[in-house]
């Protein structure tokens, strides 16, 4: 019998991503990051 | 809420074409992933499903009775469509259609029509 | 087509007891996808068909909790823990795998 036409099995799961911007001093530049699920990543 | 309701001609005779609509609110056809199947039911007997049509039209037939069964869809409208040709008295019975998504958590014939009676007679 | 097998044909119960229906399919049900669509139907008196369960074990919404569904591969069963009187009618198992897409033929589930 051919299969009844469903979705791939897998279900995708939603995450926030925030990036931001961080003034560290006038002398140092600034940090930028991002924040996936609450973790900084880069 | 999602509702659906199928209506027909009520009696017919052998030989003749049973069309039968299927109108429904609360949902699209034009949703990724939506679905409506047509399931049939003799007089106290048990089900069996027929035709589903996808939101992209990809049709499904049983295939017992696929060279008599067209399904289609007015999308705009909310509308599915079944037709029979060649009906006989073995198709007289309830006939449902029922919602069915398949990119949504409930994979499943989740919401039905109350459904319509059809009579072969002569 | 995948033959769906319920047992048994006539449960009679009193309120208040637990229920158990199986079902058999004729082969796996489970999807090339992963999932295996296995849902169980309640067809009450004069009424349409009704989602239970879905994907063996699921209950839809608004379900009872006192209903339960297990099972794999090719066996499967529906347990209802306390019978009320609204759960009177005709429980089909149905396979939403391959096509034709398939019906168990049913469990009356009535007052003994």
């Known amino acids: 019998d051919a299969e009844f036409r469903h979705d791939s099995g897998y279900e995708v799961h939603h995450q926030k991503l925030v990036f931001f911007a961080e003034d560290v001093g006038s002398n140092k530049g600034a940090i930028i990051g991002l924040m996936v699920g609450g973790v900084v990543i880069a | 809420q999602v509702t659906l309701k199928e209506s027909g001609p009520g009696i017919l005779q052998p030989s003749q074409t049973l069309s039968l609509t299927c109108s429904f609110s609360g949902f699209s056809l034009s949703t990724s992933g939506m679905g409506v199947s047509w399931i049939r039911q003799p007089s106290g007997k048990g089900l069996e499903w027929l035709a589903h049509i996808y939101w992209d039209d990809d049709k499904r037939y049983n295939p017992s009775l696929k060279s008599r069964l067209t399904i289609s869809k007015d999308t705009s409208r909310n509308q599915v469509f079944l037709k029979i040709t060649s009906v006989d008295t073995a198709d007289a019975g309830t006939y449902y259609c029922?919602?069915?998504?398949?990119?949504?958590?409930?994979?499943?014939?989740?919401?039905w029509g109350q459904g319509t009676s059809v009579t072969v007679s002569l | 087509d995948v033959l769906m097998t319920q047992t048994p044909l006539s449960l009679p119960v009193s309120l208040g007891d637990q229920a158990s229906i199986s079902c058999r399919s004729s082969?796996?049900?489970?999807?090339?996808?992963?999932?295996?669509?296995l849902e169980w139907y309640l067809q009450k008196p004069g009424q349409s068909p009704n989602l239970l369960i879905y994907k063996v074990s699921n209950r839809f919404s608004g379900v009872p909790d006192r209903f339960s569904g297990s099972g794999s591969g090719t066996d499967f069963t529906l347990k209802i823990s306390r019978v009320e009187a609204e759960d009177l009618g005709v429980y089909y198992c149905f396979q939403g795998s391959h096509v034709p897409l398939t019906f168990g033929a049913g469990t009356k589930l009535e007052l003994k």
């Open positions: 082969q796996t049900i489970v999807h090339s996808n992963g999932n295996t669509y």
């Open positions: 029922a919602r069915r998504p398949i990119r949504t958590v409930v994979d499943a014939m989740d919401y």
